[in-house]
Amino acid sequence: ALDAAYCFRNVQDNCCLRPLYIDFKRDLGWKWIHEPKGYNANFCAGACPYLWSSDTQHSRVLSLYNTINPEASASPCCVSQDLEPLTILYYIGKTPKIEQLSNMIVKSCKCS
Amino acid sequence: ALDAAYCFRNVQDNCCLRPLYIDFKRDLGWKWIHEPKGYNANFCAGACPYLWSSDTQHSRVLSLYNTINPEASASPCCVSQDLEPLTILYYIGKTPKIEQLSNMIVKSCKCS
């Protein structure tokens, strides 16, 4: 799996999970989230050569097509596979609210 | 939806469905598929600016992060959403076989 256990231990140019810390105020301009101040969102990036963690038959076809036709702009892309939620604290007036925001943290990647 | 009905009628730099015909022999080097000779595989390509058909909360966060931090390499990518199968004919020895290959044709795209 292209997850932290593999990707953070290996220098990998191909599609892999990359660390990314996001500070809500500085990076997104969001002031409404009181806790946490930021979080490890991570992201997916890297090349998708033939058979590198292909998601579907189409992405396998596309990566093979790209190998044989390297001048073509058609190629698979490295995107998130497994995502996890993030628990946040915000206020409505003076009332604190805890909520879980779904699909906020990328745990693994795929070529799609 | 970023499908043929929208994307093939509009000149769109942002994430959209793009036409791609794949000839099995010429483009993939596959000689085992006897029919069809090729098919309309299509592919997804284009920019993923903030809120352009974002797939998840993470891709929305990432596109906003990319807007505020344009020098960063972290940004969502335009990938397939809906896929459809392709019916093929091949031979096992002298016996013709018809089979449906799943997820061979891209019908729409998303920013993920």
């Epitope: - | 029919e35 069809p36 459809e84 392709l86 019916t87 004919l89 044709i105």
Partner: nanobody, 118 residues
Framework: EVQLVESGGGLVQPGGSLRLSCAAS????????ASWYRQAPGKERELVAT????????HYADSVKGRFAISRDNAKNTVFLQMDSLKSEDTAVYYC???????????WGQGTQVTVSS
């Protein structure tokens, strides 16, 4: 309503001929692979003949090559199977099948009995 209706089956002597027809309705037939399958008692259903749109070459099971001929008339939404030099081992229920080349959609006819016997 989607329908595939076969006709032309029956009893024929060895060496004789039959012409099966399959009329399609309720879908755009020209986008579909047209095939004939058969199933003999106690045996698996087997592909006999097929033709891909728009003008794909016909393909045949080895056991019927040179004796059977598949053809289609997209204007009339019909596929035919001309069966010559029939043998007793051709006895089976013959099914018409249409499946979309690109995308979802598989349809079957109800079947027509072909019996080759003297």
């Amino acid at each position: 309503e989607v329908q595939l209706v076969e006709s032309g089956g029956g009893l024929v002597q060895p060496g004789g001929s039959l012409r099966l027809s399959c009329a399609a309705s309720g879908f755009t037939f020209s986008y579909y692979v047209a095939s004939w399958y058969r199933q003999a008692p106690g045996k698996e259903r087997e592909l006999v003949a097929t033709t891909f749109p728009p003008d794909g070459s016909p393909h045949y099971a080895d056991s019927v090559k040179g004796r059977f001929a598949i053809s289609r008339d997209n204007a009339k939404n019909t596929v035919f199977l001309q069966m010559d030099s029939l043998k007793s081992e051709d006895t089976a229920v013959y099914y018409c099948n249409a499946r979309r080349v690109e995308g979802h959609g598989i349809y079957w006819g109800q079947g027509t009995q072909v019996t080759v016997s003297s």
